[in-house]
């Protein structure tokens, strides 16, 4: 039994780091392998992660960690029974993938403006809380070419856009993801998407519609 692709890990900079690797053949990761991880200099016993299968030869392990300090460095030992397959280290602050934002809501109660809000995935005492910026993706369910990204570079988890910039009378979906420049993170996963119907009417169209209506009377 050998490691084909060495473990690579990313941290959410809060409580979980995820390590993935590939073996040289089909493996029952949870019964055959253990990933031991320990903070460098920590005097108490190493923690053990039981991996899960991630495809035939792939394994994934979710390492439970205390709130992360930027200088934290972990030793990683991958064992198959009594055999040490791989030894490495992992510094969470250098491999951050933020948690995905949540609670994405589209507020359509203001006639000419769409307000999108979402929740910051970190508590206020986490370093990333004040360092996230976001990308909002809006697309049309009817027209694959109607696909746009809005970069939100300020801290407030919200975006205002003119309803008139979207096509009227059709359904749109939106999703949001986050990253933090300070730790040169990767992008988070996208949030779950939310759907709404863009019923905005141009003022001229509204006027024209009303005029036509009266004409019928």
């Amino acid at each position: 039994m050998k490691v084909l692709q060495e473990p690579t890990c990313v941290s959410d900079y809060m409580s979980i780091s995820t390590c993935e690797w590939k073996m040289n053949g089909p493996t029952n990761c949870s019964t055959e392998l253990r990933l031991l991880y320990q903070l460098v200099f920590l005097l108490s016993e190493a923690h053990t992660c039981i991996p899960e299968n991630n495809g035939g030869a792939g394994c994934v392990c979710h390492l439970l960690m205390d709130d992360v300090v930027s200088a934290d460095n972990y030793t990683l030992d991958l064992w198959a029974g009594q055999q040490l397959l791989w030894k490495g280290s992992f510094k969470p602050s250098e491999h951050v993938k933020p948690r995905a934002p949540g609670n994405l809501t589209v507020h359509t109660n203001v006639s000419d403006t769409l307000l999108l809000t979402w929740s910051n995935p970190y508590p206020p005492d986490n370093y990333l809380y004040n360092h996230l910026t976001y990308a909002v993706n809006i697309w049309s369910e009817n027209d694959p070419a109607d696909f746009r990204i809005y970069n939100v570079t300020y801290l407030e988890p919200s975006l205002r856009i003119a309803a008139s910039t979207l096509k009227s009378g059709i359904s749109y979906r939106a999703r949001v993801r986050a990253w933090a420049q300070c730790y040169n993170t990767t992008w988070s996963e996208w949030s779950p998407s939310t759907k709404w119907h863009n019923s905005y009417r141009e003022p001229f169209e509204q006027h024209h519609h009303h005029h036509h209506h009266h004409h019928h009377h």
Epitope: F41, L43, S44, E45, V69
Partner: antibody, heavy 119, light 108 residues
Framework: EVQLVESGGGLVQPGGSLKLSCAAS????????MSWVRQTPDKRLELVAT????????NYPDSVKGRFTISRDNAKNTLYLQMSSLKSEDTAMYYC????????????WGQGTSVTVSS | DIQMTQSPASLSASVGETVTITCRAS??????LAWYQQKQGKSPQFLVY???TLAEGVPSRFSGSGSGTQFSLKINSLQPEDFGSYYC??????????FGGGTKLEIK
């Protein structure tokens, strides 16, 4: 309930030796790092010895290096501190403390045993 | 070794008041800092780790903050059981971890 109970303290002459013990209960002793911390009469705290969970790694400050030895017997759930070539400045209350599972802070302390070095 | 300097060495306060104790490290220790409380005649008790995370069972009137070299422990609405001595301790790097000199908090 986590309990750490120190014993072995007492009055000893300068240059003498003493061995302190700490009986641990209420947790899986063999998985925790342990330490000895002393509190001098002026109430200052000093970490005098640390040992990792399996006993393979120990550490001491310069003030006691070569004179103090920390050891553990995981089968007996007991931590030890062998002190030799004692000096008057070693007079203190000696506490046994357990290292937190996820950080090197000390989450449980014993009630302490008093060591007095005097002629 | 990294030196830890606590201030003030002592302070008097009344029940209900808010107090802040500070701890300064001689070099960057990131957030590798713990706080302990010691009542007269008792052993120290674990209060805070990682500079800001409360240990299990510690009341929310306690809060830790800071990183790098400057740290503080704040106690809101002091209770009678809060009086005693407080110590900071760093645990950065190899195990030559040092304590601050302590702060004695007395009832006014």
């Amino acid at each position: 309930e986590v309990q750490l109970v120190e014993s072995g303290g007492g009055l000893v002459q300068p240059g003498g030796s003493l061995k302190l013990s700490c009986a641990a209960s209420g947790f899986t002793f063999s998985t925790y790092g342990m330490s000895w911390v002393r509190q001098t009469p002026d109430k200052r705290l000093e970490l005098v010895a640390t040992i990792n969970s399996n006993g393979g790694s120990t550490n001491y400050p310069d003030s006691v290096k070569g004179r103090f030895t920390i050891s553990r017997d995981n089968a007996k759930n007991t931590l030890y501190l062998q002190m030799s070539s004692l000096k008057s400045e070693d007079t203190a209350m000696y506490y046994c403390a357990r290292f937190f599972r996820i950080r090197n802070a000390m989450d449980y302390w014993g009630q302490g045993t008093s060591v007095t070095v005097s002629s | 070794d990294i030196q830890m300097t606590q201030s003030p060495a002592s302070l008097s306060a009344s029940v209900g008041e808010t107090v802040t104790i500070t701890c300064r490290a001689s070099e960057n220790i990131y957030s590798y800092l713990a706080w302990y409380q010691q009542k007269q005649g008792k052993s120290p008790q674990f209060l805070v780790y990682n500079a800001k995370t409360l240990a299990e069972g510690v009341p929310s009137r306690f809060s830790g903050s800071g990183s790098g070299t400057q740290f503080s422990l704040k106690i809101n609405s002091l209770q009678p059981e809060d009086f005693g001595s407080y110590y900071c301790q760093h645990y950065y790097g190899t195990p030559t971890w040092t304590f601050g000199g302590g702060t004695k908090l007395e009832i006014k």
